[in-house]
């Protein structure tokens, strides 16, 4: 089931997925002056079985000069309404991470791909937020948003990330030393976190991120 909306926008923050659930689609977008090859895939699709997941199809871009145009290839109107953009990719290298059943890693860049990746996320997808350069989070721990299905409608949970002040750059997991175990709102030290997604391993990995207090939901 595709998520209807984009992940929430947080002031002075960007989001990134550590891995992508099966069913996720990534548009094959080319940078200006290039286009998809003839009969090329419109998108890559995360598929697989319980033991292994990978991206089906390959995105390929070719110069559009032969067509005497520099117009960028964009999705058709019916595709457009489902566009999900990750602001982080430009493009990203795969993140070194544990293999998650039913999830694909970040696809490697393809030649002449667009600077912005457009994903079509599915229910259960989790994305992580960090403050942009020059801003710093008020709280520590992963700020995450999950696409959930409620009463037949999809919605993203709201990360309580507050990015403030002209501070040093914050990093994504794996790019700075670990800080603290992931926390949500101040929860009793003897009680369990209320994060119940199959992404718990990713929550552990994202513990290096500086984020905020509501990383686990009230329930």
């Amino acid at each position: 089931e595709l998520c209807d909306d984009d992940p929430p926008e947080i002031p002075h923050a960007t989001f990134k997925a550590m891995a992508y659930k099966e069913g996720t689609m990534l548009n094959c977008e080319c940078k200006r002056g290039f286009r998809r090859i003839k009969s090329g895939s419109l998108y890559m699709l995360c598929t697989g079985n319980s033991s292994h997941s990978s991206w089906d199809n390959q995105c390929q871009c070719t110069s559009s000069a032969t067509r005497n145009t520099t117009k960028q290839v964009t999705p058709q109107p019916e595709e457009q309404k489902e566009r999900k953009t990750t602001e982080m990719q430009s493009p990203m290298q795969p993140v070194d991470q544990a293999s998650l059943p039913g999830h694909c890693r970040e696809p490697p860049p393809w030649e002449n791909e667009a600077t912005e990746r457009i994903y079509h996320f599915v229910v259960g997808q989790m994305v992580y937020y960090q403050c942009v350069q020059g801003y710093r989070a008020l709280h520590r721990g992963p700020a995450e948003s999950v696409c959930k299905m409620t009463h037949g409608k999809t919605r993203w949970t709201q990360p309580q990330l507050i990015c403030t002040g002209e501070m040093e750059t914050s990093q994504f997991p794996g790019e700075e030393k670990p800080q603290a175990s992931p926390e949500g709102r101040p929860e009793s030290e003897t009680s369990c976190l209320v994060t119940t997604t199959d992404f718990q391993i990713q929550t552990e990995m994202a513990a290096t991120m500086e984020t905020s207090i509501f990383t686990t939901e009230y329930q």
């Epitope: 002075h12 710093r136 520590r140 926390e183 101040p186 009793s188 509501f214």
Partner: antibody, heavy 114, light 111 residues
């Protein structure tokens, strides 16, 4: 259970100083930004100051800038507010709060009067 | 003067639905920051009632709901009860102050 317990309030003369403390328990104190919020008698809530989880940055309301200092000791799970050059208009119940803020202490009364 | 604007008072009879508004600016609510609502019963500390515009902490009845649009937000209380008589405050982060700002508070009276 999350608990925030303020102390250090009392009666002080204008121009005097006080140091408020807030003892936190029931959560990982060192992971959260902390606030001081005050409420003058019969009035609304007024944010005073915030400190990041590691104490690396602090912000203050204009009304207290240069007179109040927020600090924290993560090894003691304690938040502080050093209040100098106190004025009559600083009279209020002072609450310490965690996060959004979503958890609040019960408050400590500061009275500035001659 | 508070940065967020709320009506000073609101009232309703038991069972009724009441709405409290909260208006901000482009540096707080309009900048994309979430709105949170607090309930303060007489003589007690504020308690978080709604977070992230429309989410309820555990223990808060579903009679309480929140919404946000543009530079304003609102709190709705349906099926009003006598124990809802309290002061209600909205709050949001303000990027120009680097701290949360509060509304002036709305005193709710259950007639």
């Amino acid at each position: 259970e999350v608990q925030l317990l303020e102390s250090g309030g009392g009666l002080v003369q204008p121009g005097g100083s006080l140091r408020l403390s807030c003892a936190a328990s029931g959560f990982t104190f060192s992971s959260y930004g902390m606030h001081w919020v005050r409420q003058a008698p019969g009035k609304g809530l007024e944010w005073v100051s915030v400190i990041s989880y590691d104490g690396s940055y602090k912000y203050y309301a204009d009304s207290v800038k240069g007179r109040f200092t927020i600090s924290r000791d993560n090894s003691k799970n304690t938040l502080y507010l050093q209040m100098n050059s106190l004025r009559a208009e600083d009279t209020a119940v002072y609450y310490c709060a965690a996060g959004v803020p979503d958890y609040w202490g019960q408050g400590t009364l500061v009275t500035v009067s001659s | 003067q508070s940065v967020l604007t709320q009506p000073p008072s609101a009232s309703g009879t038991p069972g009724q639905r009441v709405t409290i508004s909260c208006t901000g600016s482009s540096s707080n609510i309009g900048a994309g920051y979430d709105v949170h609502w607090y309930q303060q019963l007489p003589g007690t500390a504020p308690k978080l009632l709604i977070y992230s515009n429309n989410e309820r902490p555990s223990g808060v009845p579903d009679r309480f709901s929140g919404s946000k649009s543009g530079t304003s937000a609102s709190l709705a209380i349906s099926g009003l009860r006598s124990e809802d008589e309290a002061d209600y405050y909205c709050a949001a982060w303000d990027i120009s102050l680097n701290g949360p700002v509060f509304g002036g508070g709305t005193k709710l009276t259950v007639l």
